[in-house]
């Protein structure tokens, strides 16, 4: 009669955490007697699984009846796989002996890996907010995955980019490993509404990457350009001045006037106009009784945006061009139309 | 191609501890047996013990109080710590890998580090 | 224990002469698979020692063909058919069988 063979049909199978993995094994002889049980790994180190005739093993049932005469059916299926129940298992029969039972014959193992899907990427950005033509770094970070092959990439307003450096952990074996990838990103100062992306493809994703997402707007800052101007006359003695803060992001500035290096007025931006690309856009005016100053008048103004240091523009009135008539109850003349001469000598 | 290597103190004092490391580079922990093996200067091989992949150990009797051996799978990594040394654990100590197939058990001591020399002096 | 006694002591060779080395056993290394859990290992000076013959019989990945391991039970012998000058330094022998692994005292070969 032909010596028992005991039969691992599956070199290896796949199975996602959470599932039930069924390792199959039939035996090709009822002779001889004695107790079939699986072990995980080979040698003296080697793990019990499951004994037909003793033990108490929660998770495995097996696939068939054990107690019919005639089974040569010793498949076996465990319950709620994780990725610490990955490894090679042995199917293995074993003949009566005395005192105990002496390992006949193993099957050629199956291999377990385990499929475990990598949690959503978390995108982060710098600490610190930074202006146009700065590069900044991004984060991006994955975890949980098995197996260790992953893919992932980089887009900014859906162009792929290639400036990222991608780590997976551990480099040894592990139930599970996480991946962590740093890109760099050139700001323009039309990125308050970009969008960076990570995405993680795993063969557990059945081709639906996930997606983990980060707004330039909470990492740009656009300082504002300034431009001061003189209005036309409201009034016989007054000017008004403007001061136009265009393109800044994000909203968060302070203006102030100073009228010849003295505070005349501080106002925290409100009523912002958007543009398109996001940015903001403030005006801020002054009426400057010209008739109040004997000598000319240099308004500057000030801008602190977001916490950075003040950034100021500057406009002169020249009074000196138009004396005053002394004693006079009439009013004085027109008020300045600009910071140049009107005709003469000056 | 698996390579191993050991790293470590060369000198160690009497009564401390010895400790090293082998880092296996080009394959995998999972389904062998790592070993410590030592040689005495001018002597023969003596095991000290190994661990499995699931992180079971196996020692030297003669060594068993004095020996840990411990498995680090996420760094590639074993290590080996031996207490209160003396003068007659001055050796060159080297990690090696053994086979092992069901059926069969272990089947050979395949892969063997360089070797460090490890000298118990005050 | 098991203890492992290895012979001779010091075996001067000639190259292309044929060498044996012997390695006795305290007890018997044949199991009930059929397998005798003896390997064979060379150290060749100032190197590691390297696999040459694993379950008694079988020759090691890369080792030659002129090596060839026999024996079962408590008495094994390493045969090299023709020595050649590569092939000095010390044989151990060693028994896989249960814990602790044990070598032989060694076998250092030479040419004479």
């Known amino acids: 009669e032909e010596e028992l063979q005991v039969i691992q049909p599956d070199k290896s199978i796949s199975v996602a955490a959470g599932e039930s993995a069924t390792l199959h094994c039939t035996v090709t002889s009822l002779i001889p007697v004695g107790p079939i049980q699986w072990f995980r790994g080979a040698g003296p180190g080697r793990e019990l699984i499951y004994n037909q005739k003793e033990g108490h093993f929660p998770r495995v049932t097996t696939v068939s009846d054990l107690t019919k005469r005639n089974n040569m059916d010793f498949s076996i299926r465990i319950s709620n796989i994780t990725p610490a129940d990955a490894g090679t298992y042995y199917c293995v029969k074993f003949r009566k002996g005395s005192p105990d039972h002496v390992e006949f014959k193993s099957g050629a193992g199956t291999e377990l890996s385990v499929r475990a899907k990598p949690s959503a990427p978390v995108v982060s950005g710098p600490a610190a907010r930074a202006t146009p033509q700065h590069t900044v770094s991004f984060t991006c970070e994955s975890h949980g995955f098995s197996p260790r092959d992953i893919t992932l990439k980089w887009f900014k307003n859906g162009n792929e980019l290639s400036d990222f450096q991608t780590n997976v952990d551990p480099a040894g074996d592990s139930v599970s490993y996480s991946i962590h990838s740093t890109a760099k990103v050139v700001l323009t100062r039309e990125d308050v509404h970009s969008q960076v992306i990570c995405e993680v493809a795993h063969v557990t994703l059945q081709g639906d990457p996930l997606r983990g997402t980060a707004n330039l707007s909470e990492t740009i800052r656009v300082p504002p350009t300034l431009e001061v101007t003189q209005q036309p006359v409201r009034a016989e003695n007054q000017v008004n001045v403007t001061c136009q803060v265009r393109k800044f992001y994000p909203q968060r500035l302070q203006l102030t006037w100073l009228e010849n290096g003295n505070v005349s007025r501080t106002e925290t931006a409100s009523t912002l106009t958007e543009n398109k690309d996001g940015t903001y856009n403030w005006m801020s005016w002054l009426l400057v009784n010209v008739s109040a100053h004997r000598d000319d008048v240099k308004l500057t103004c000030q801008v602190e945006h977001d916490g950075q240091p003040a950034v100021s523009k500057s406009h002169d009135l020249k009074v000196s061009a138009h004396p005053k008539e002394q004693g006079s109850n009439t009013a004085p003349g027109p008020a300045l139309a600009s910071a140049a001469p009107l005709g003469g000598s000056g | 191609q698996v390579q191993l290597q050991e790293s470590g103190p060369g000198l160690v004092r009497p009564s401390e501890t010895l400790s090293l490391t082998c880092t296996v580079s080009?394959?995998?922990?999972?389904?062998?047996?790592w070993s410590w093996i030592r040689q005495p200067p001018g002597k023969g091989l003596e095991w000290m013990g190994f661990?499995?992949?699931?992180?079971?150990?196996f020692y030297n009797p003669s060594l068993k109080s004095r020996v840990t051996i411990s498995l680090d799978m996420s760094m590639n990594q074993f290590s080996l710590k031996m207490t209160s040394v003396t003068a007659a654990d001055t050796a060159v100590y080297y990690c090696?890998?053994?086979?092992?197939?069901?059926?069969?058990?272990?089947?050979?001591?395949?892969?063997w580090g360089q070797g460090t020399t490890v000298t118990v002096s005050s | 224990d098991i203890v492992m006694t290895q012979s001779p002591l010091s075996l001067p060779v000639t190259p292309g002469e044929p060498a044996s080395i012997s390695c006795k056993s305290s007890?018997?290394?044949?199991?009930?698979?059929?397998?005798?859990?003896l390997d064979w290992y060379l150290q060749r000076p100032g190197q590691s020692p390297q696999l040459l013959i694993y379950?008694?019989?079988n020759r090691a990945s890369g080792v030659p063909d002129r090596f060839s391991g026999s024996g079962s039970g408590t008495d094994f012998t390493l045969k090299i058919s023709r020595v050649e000058a590569e092939d000095v330094g010390v044989y151990y022998c060693?028994?896989?069988?249960?814990?602790?692994?044990?070598f032989g005292g060694g076998t250092k070969v030479e040419i004479k």
């Open positions: 090696a890998r053994v086979r092992a197939y069901s059926g069969i058990g272990l089947d050979g001591t395949d892969v």
């Open positions: 080009g394959g995998s922990i999972r389904n062998y047996y």
């Open positions: 661990i499995y992949d699931n992180g079971r150990t």
């Open positions: 007890q018997s290394l044949l199991y009930s698979n059929g397998y005798a859990y």
């Open positions: 379950l008694g019989s």
């Open positions: 060693m028994q896989a069988l249960q814990t602790p692994l044990t």
